[in-house]
Interface confidence: low
């Protein structure tokens, strides 16, 4: 026999929530269990399905799960079948709906003093309790002539008046939960004595000295009052106009006319309607004075043929917003084609040379018109008028290389020397026509030059070789005054260059021949052993066939070079004592001595009372201070040479004798005692 161990039982359930109808059977043979709903087999779905022998509900549905469920166990072998007790759900639910007009039949039939009934279409089980709201505020039973039943879904307003106007909504709750109306109802019951807007004034923009009209109308029973105010609450009537509104007229129909509008008339105008009852109705409109600013300037534009270009016209600020259009040769541009206007842009597609010229952007509004021209140049690739030529330039003179081209716009020309860009300086100058001037041509200017002529459309280039015709010159020019050391070997060099290698020879300025111990070896004057008689004026002569000769005069002096007889020594002196730095030099001509102390020359005329330089060259410093410490340099010089020697000076504090030392103890370092 089939026995039910657990049978399904009726139970409460919540809409959309889980539920389970239990069923467990015991039988000797293999039984198969299925479920019936109102006698019909239950098909498994994702929402409702058998779980073992029980029936599981993922989400209870009040429509699909209403009825009687029964668990059936069947032994397919014996044909025995057993059925469980019936079970059903008590499904709790609530569902939102709109607030609808129940009476009268349509909104058009709602009149003051008629009965109005609204119905709240929120349904549920168990039966919900309802709450009504007007403009979000709860309504209670009997409040302000409403008859409201909180158990019922109807709200009756008897009689309905203007004070009942508002947005009606409802909410309801039951054991399942709460819901509020999905769509609310706006009740509008006009009070004939309230001012109602018929015609509202609109903002206006007018040009200076033009007229402006504001229209304003209200209706009510009895007819309402209408008043105009300006900005500072100044009333405007035909009898009393404020000084700045002398030209204002209020018409019988409520319209306000302002003639010959001035800037001071601009502002907010208020039209106020007041019925016998109810609040004043205030309408605002603004009078703007039309204005238009100047347009920014365009930079001239250069475009290349075949390209597409756009020029944006920034409209001037203005009220109302100015309209913008482009013109060329007095004709407004179309909105499509090859040259056309797109928004505020001038578009030139596939530019031709003929497109060059002046294009004008116009902007206009009530306040006037503005315009701005843009000059468009269509660039062409440069062509040659004169290319640079291979040239021979003379050293030391200015040289010119030409690069003459023509194009639109005027081409820019740059020059390169040995592939390096030539920047203009004191030696190179590029003229406006493209010619390169080399001031004072030098030997190393002999190289390749290249000029490039460019416009936005393209560039052309050409190059030329410069050969420098070298002048006859000494390299380097001999020093005009030179010294030779007595009784020593000496050389005086002289070299020169030219277009052809020059020959070089020396002679004495008086024309006498050189002594036998003096030789002229390929331009170098050589003295085996200098004597006093070798002093004098000599001339170096360089010459070649094509360029003639050049001369350089040299005065040679014979001198005994400087040596120091006495050199200054490293010296340490007590503060406040006197320092002596000795220095003596000899030579011919007799050398002069200068001292340099702490990196500056000591000027004998500006030494002050503490310092003195003796005739023999020694330097004395009285009352020495720590700041006198440093390196002192003795410089001996004459017209032929210069020598220097240096020694440091240390200034120290005199030590206080300690008791252990005898009165005659020597200082711990070598001192000058004064």
């Amino acid at each position: 026999a089939i026995v039910f161990i657990k049978q399904p039982s009726s139970q409460d359930a919540l809409q959309g929530r889980r539920a389970l109808l239990r069923c467990e059977v015991e039988a000797p043979g293999l039984v198969h269990v299925y479920w019936l709903l109102d006698g019909a087999p239950v098909q498994d779905t994702e929402r409702r399905f058998t779980q073992g022998s029980s029936l599981s509900f993922a989400a209870v549905d009040r429509l699909q799960d209403s009825g009687t469920f029964q668990c059936v166990a069947r032994d397919d072998v014996t044909g025995e079948e057993a059925r469980s007790a019936n079970a059903s759900f008590n499904i709790k639910w609530i569902e939102a709906g709109p607030v609808v007009l129940k009476h009268p039949a349509s909104e058009a039939e709602i009149q003051p003093q008629t009965q109005v009934t609204l119905r709240c279409h929120i349904d549920g089980h168990p039966r919900p309790t309802y709450q009504w709201f007007r403009d979000g505020t709860p309504l209670s039973d009997g409040q302000s002539n409403n008859t409201v039943s909180s158990k019922e879904r109807n709200l009756t307003l008897r009689p309905a008046g203007p004070e009942h106007s508002g947005l009606y909504s409802c909410c309801a709750h039951n054991a399942f939960g709460q819901a509020c109306s999905s769509q609310n109802f706006t009740l509008s019951i006009a009070d004939e004595s309230f001012a109602r807007v018929v015609l509202a004034p609109q903002d206006v923009i007018v040009a200076r000295n033009e007229e402006a009209m504001f229209h304003c109308q209200f209706s009510a029973q009895p007819p309402p009052n209408l008043q105009w105010l300006f900005e500072d609450e100044t009333p405007i009537t035909n009898r009393s106009r404020p000084p700045h509104l002398r030209r204002a007229t209020v018409f019988a129909n409520g319209s306000l006319l302002l003639t010959q509008v001035r800037p001071r008339n601009a502002g907010v105008y208020r039209c106020i309607g007041q019925g016998q009852r109810g609040p004043p109705v205030i309408l605002e409109a603004t009078l703007h004075l039309a204005e238009i600013e100047d347009m920014p300037l365009f930079e001239p534009r250069v475009f290349t043929a075949g390209s597409e270009e756009r020029v944006t016209c920034l409209p001037p600020k203005g009220l109302p917003e100015p309209s913008v259009w482009w013109e060329h040769a007095g004709v407004r541009l179309p909105t499509h084609g090859r040259v056309y206007q797109k928004g505020h842009e001038l578009v030139l597609a596939s530019i031709a040379e003929s497109d060059a010229g002046v294009y004008t952007c116009h902007a206009a509004n009530l306040a006037g018109q503005r315009r701005q021209d843009v000059n468009i140049t269509v660039a062409t690739v440069p062509t040659w008028l004169k290319k640079p030529q291979d040239s021979q330039l003379e050293e030391g003179k200015p040289g010119y290389l030409h690069c003459l081209t023509q194009a639109t716009p005027k081409p820019t020309v740059v020059w390169y020397r040995n592939q390096m860009l030539i920047s203009e300086d004191s030696r190179f100058e590029v003229f406006k026509n493209g010619t390169l001037r080399i001031n004072n041509v030098e030997v190393y200017d002999g190289t390749w030059y290249r000029c490039v002529s460019s416009t936005p459309a393209g560039s052309i280039e050409a190059q030329a070789r410069v050969q420098v015709l070298e002048k006859l010159k000494f390299t380097p020019p001999p020093q005009p005054q030179q010294c030779m050391e007595f009784d020593k070997e000496a050389t005086v060099p002289c070299s020169a260059t030219g277009r052809e290698k020059p020959t070089i020879k020396w002679e004495r300025a008086d024309g006498s021949s050189l002594p036998e111990w003096v030789t002229d070896n390929a331009g170098t004057l050589h003295f085996a052993r200098v004597t006093r008689d070798d002093a004098g004026n000599y001339t170096c002569i360089a010459s070649n066939g094509p360029q003639g000769q050049i001369r350089a005069h040299v005065q040679l002096t014979v001198a005994v070079f400087i040596t120091f007889k006495v050199e200054p020594e490293r010296t340490t002196v007590y503060q406040g004592h006197t320092a002596l730095l000795q220095c003596e030099a000899q030579g011919d001509p007799k050398p002069l001595i200068q001292w340099k102390g702490k990196d500056r020359i000591l000027d004998p005329t500006k030494l002050g009372p503490r310092m003195h330089i003796f005739q023999n060259g020694s330097l004395v410093i009285h009352d020495v201070a720590p700041e006198d410490s440093g390196r002192y340099t003795c410089i001996a010089g004459n017209s032929c040479n210069i020598k220097h020697t240096e020694a440091p000076l240390y200034v120290v504090d005199k030590p206080v004798p300690e008791e252990s030392e005898g009165p005659g103890s020597p200082p711990p370092y070598k001192m000058i005692q004064t």
């Epitope: 390209s307 597409e308 909105t335 499509h336 797109k342 928004g343 597609a349």
Partner: antibody
Amino acid sequence: EVQLVESGGGLVQPGGSLRLSCAASGFTFSSYDMHWVRQATGKGLEWVSGINTDGDTFYPGSVKGRFTISRENAKNSLYLQMNSLRAGDTAVYYCARRGWNYGFDYWGQGTLVTVSS
Amino acid sequence: DIQMTQSPSSLSASVGDRVTITCQASQDIRNYLNWYQQKPGKAPKLLIYDASNLETGVPSRFSGSGSGTDFTFTISSLQPEDIATYYCQPYDNLMYTFGGGTKVEIK
């Protein structure tokens, strides 16, 4: 908020006609160029036509002579009249607004056109 | 008409990777190029206009560059929400043909 809503799509036989509409809101319709773009299933975007603020129209070669774009500024509406339809015209058709930056800055959700016998 | 060659047609990258897409125009279009993102089942969205300008509200990891005929679109650090197809679009001479698209997937 800018909104573009296409309508008028559906099933049509080869050689037939269909008229698509695009309702615009949330911007000054008359101030903007408007365009139609289509996309066949699993394929890329294909520009179909455009109309500027003056009513000038533009088409690629693939639809020229068969499709006509138009606009009704008073109704904030854009239209695409499609004649002599072919199977290759099957696609989702989008309407798009061309912004001042020349990009299609707002698009509709699309309407499906199926050309099949 | 201008032809646009977009490559690659698809790519797979890891989160955080730098992703680059290129678009080549058959003629000089200056900087007149837009980039769009289209997620499955959605309308395209404008990301970049005039080759390199970011549309308002678009994250700064998206960028574009190039002018003339060669253009590049870059996602500096790929995010899961960037899975989409990306299209380039020129707008020269009143024509608005799109590139073939690049499908971006996460490895």
